[in-house]
Amino acid sequence: MKVLQEPTCVSDYMSISTCEWKMNGPTNCSTELRLLYQLVFLLSEAHTCVPENNGGAGCVCHLLMDDVVSADNYTLDLWAGQQLLWKGSFKPSEHVKPRAPGNLTVHTNVSDTLLLTWSNPYPPDNYLYNHLTYAVNIWSENDPADFRIYNVTYLEPSLRIAASTLKSGISYRARVRAWAQCYNTTWSEWSPSTKWHNSYREPF
């Protein structure tokens, strides 16, 4: 049993890091493998992650972490029974994928303006809370070409757009994702989309 693609990990910079790797053949990840991880810190304890299958030869493990900060560095050991298959390290702050924003809502009660709001996925005491910027994707269910991205570079998790910039009388969907420049993160996953009917009326 050998590792074909070494584990690569990303952190949500809050409580979970996800590691993925590929074996050289079909593997029952949860019964055959264990990923041990330990913070390189005084008094830290070793933890064991039981991986799940991710395709025939792929495995994924969700590592639970406390109080993630930029100085943290973890040792990773991938075991198959008594055999050490791979040894590495992981610094969460250097591989951040933010959590997806939630609670995306479209407020249509102001006739000529659409207000989109969503929730910041981090608590106020997390460093990313004040450092996320967002991209809002709006598209028409009727017209695949009617697809637009709005970059929200301010901290407030909201976006105002004129209803007149969208076609009237048709349904639209929106979703939002986040990233943080300070840690050079990847984009988060998209939030669940929300749907509304754009009933903007042109003034006579």
Partner: antibody, heavy 116, light 111 residues
Framework: QVQLVQSGAEVKKPGASVKVSCKAS????????MHWVRQAPGQGLEWMGI????????SYAQKFQGRVTMTRDTSTSTVYMELSSLRSEDTAVYYC?????????WGKGTLVTVSS | QSVLTQPPSVSAAPGQKVTISCSGG????????VSWYQQLPGTAPKLLIY???KRPSGIPDRFSGSKSGTSATLGITGLQTGDEADYYC????????????FGTGTKLTVL
Amino acid sequence: QVQLVQSGAEVKKPGASVKVSCKASGYAFTSYYMHWVRQAPGQGLEWMGIINPRGGSTSYAQKFQGRVTMTRDTSTSTVYMELSSLRSEDTAVYYCARGKYWMYDWGKGTLVTVSS
Amino acid sequence: QSVLTQPPSVSAAPGQKVTISCSGGGSSIGNSYVSWYQQLPGTAPKLLIYDNNKRPSGIPDRFSGSKSGTSATLGITGLQTGDEADYYCGTWDTSPVWEWPFGTGTKLTVL
């Protein structure tokens, strides 16, 4: 919000022991290390040691080895610092402070006076 | 236990800018991150800066931190009378043993 509530002031005789408590609330108690730091009157901050509330393991500054014991009670989310063989130079305010590499939150402090 | 060196006192007028230095021999500052704490008279220390230059939520951007080599600096702009306090730098060291040294402390007087 995070709160670290410390026990009240103590007056002790030289040679005695003191046990200071620090009750935590507003966060997951076992997810954050706790430090103890002291400050003698008019002096600076001095690190005494650290405890991992999850397993209870500890590490102490060399200066206090053999005299200090840090413990925790997860059922009450409380950490304790006991200092024995007290001498007059142990008169200080003793702080608990939550954090790992740095101290995010501090208790208000407990004044321990050692006097004959 | 190693100690980090700070100037005993600094002073400046309201609205001015002040800097407080923190230097450490050995490996402490050079290999680690620096934090800064503010201690107002009669109160517990409060975290101002961590990770050399990051501010916890609620700390105004008048406070800034930087690090170069084995020394670090705390900057305070737009000084206010309420900034009058003792300021301590802190870090951690892992050699020969783990420890958390603090600076000697700097008394800031707002004239």
